[in-house]
Interface confidence: low
Amino acid sequence: APRGTQAEESPFVGNPGNITGARGLTGTLRCQLQVQGEPPEVHWLRDGQILELADSTQTQVPLGEDEQDDWIVVSQLRITSLQLSDTGQYQCLVFLGHQTFVSQPGYVGLEGLPYFLEEPEDRTVAANTPFNLSCQAQGPPEPVDLLWLQDAVPLATAPGHGPQRSLHVPGLNKTSSFSCEAHNAKGVTTSRTATITVLPQQPRNLHLVSRQPTELEVAWTPGLSGIYPLTHCTLQAVLSDDGMGIQAGEPDPPEEPLTSQASVPPHQLRLGSLHPHTPYHIRVACTSSQGPSSWTHWLPVETPEGVPLGPPENISATRNGSQAFVHWQEPRAPLQGTLLGYRLAYQGQDTPEVLMDIGLRQEVTLELQGDGSVSNLTVCVAAYTAAGDGPWSLPVPLEAWRPGQAQPVHQLVKEPSTPAFSWPWW
């Protein structure tokens, strides 16, 4: 066997003591050794593992004048703010030439009031809706028993008898406070107090009651709000843009919503100033003194088409012999829907009015029958959508065409001589 493996006397003349205390305690462990010759560096072990970043100081005192005389070496390990991770068995380690020496162990223990690893957090919950709260504490000493309190009233007869780490609350109808007490052999620690704010439940059954081209009437069913009456509900509408793709529960639409407040009851609201024939998405939330409910999902709705708000513009009507030329331009006023076409009405003095559907053309040539002797012939034009006819233009008299007057280029149309479209008095 190699030389130097025989048991030699330990150089340690002072071993680490024991420290037991509560969290946050500051303490010092101390090793002392006496060696001959150059003093070694002292390393500290915790549970056999070398402490790489130990807060240690080493003091070396020569006992003689010669370097080869004995030295006293003192190493002190400082533990600041004692934590659970600091607990364990501590030893000093030195290398002296051919030997490794380890001191007798000292022990660091933690013992005090319970320490919270997790405490109940403030939160909001909907009225009458179940939720859970968490609380976790540890010693030492163990065991640690928990006691939950609601509005300062214990929820069990004794610590450890009720719910422990997780408290299930089946629902609240008023804003309440919760805390937990942690009990061990050293005493009691109380957690922070969590405030659980009771908000109204999300409204249900948001639906359309009636539709107009520029307004929608909507209604909903309010959710429970506990002991707090609802003060108002807020409705938001946003243009869907026919492909914006707001899905159920998707966060927020891309543009600023139109927001309206409704006094409640009734749980109904007329949304005005909307665009006709336009898809929207709407949602609603209701508010009590404690705060607002969550929003409902976005509901897709659509305003219906309306009739055009104005007549066609720049109507001209001229006659040249047996032909009448009428042309016009699209209304400047909003169409409130998809333009499907134009209706034309004409009437002579002392003759009944006749209606014609012109379609989407903006001019028509009529083949007049007879000698055209009917006097004071007037023409009116109206635009129409699927919702119906818009306002008629003022009557425009049929004027005789004069040579040199511009005449529109158009397709000649000979209207069929069915009873609806014949002018038998000409």
Partner: nanobody
Framework: QVKLEESGGGLVQAGGSLRLSCATS????????MAWFRQAPEKERDFVGF???????YYDDSVKGRFTISRDNAQNTVYLQMNSLKPEDTAVYYC???????????????WGQGTQVTVSS
């Protein structure tokens, strides 16, 4: 019984390099302090250095800057890379485990059988 086996020793000229290996029979390398010692003829065994459980290394002043200790946890092996060797580095090199046990109260190491390193001038 845990065994340690050193290898890699031999004859080398001054200024040369050698790499010693220390293989263990159990998975102790990652959790124990592994140390290298050397014993020259007619002398006491001297401490060379150690590698701690977290991978930190500590060297004796006589080898600092020339020797490097490393560890391969997967192979349960510790290495001693020796560069710029000098004739005074001639010795039998031993590796040792400093046990990570709760009853560690004295100088009870587990030793290998050693490997001879000879540095010629």
């Amino acid at each position: 019984q845990v065994k340690l086996e050193e290898s890699g020793g031999g004859l080398v000229q001054a200024g040369g390099s050698l790499r010693l290996s220390c293989a263990t029979s159990t998975r102790t390398v990652s959790s124990a302090v592994m140390a290298w010692f050397r014993q020259a003829p007619e002398k006491e065994r001297d401490f060379v250095g150690f590698i701690s459980n977290s991978g930190s290394v500590y060297y004796d002043d006589s080898v600092k800057g020339r020797f490097t200790i490393s560890r391969d946890n997967a192979q349960n092996t510790v290495y001693l890379q020796m560069n710029s060797l000098k004739p005074e580095d001639t010795a039998v090199y031993y590796c040792a485990i400093i046990w990570r046990t709760s009853d560690l109260t004295g100088r009870f190491n587990t030793w290998g059988q050693g490997t001879q390193v000879t540095v010629s001038s």
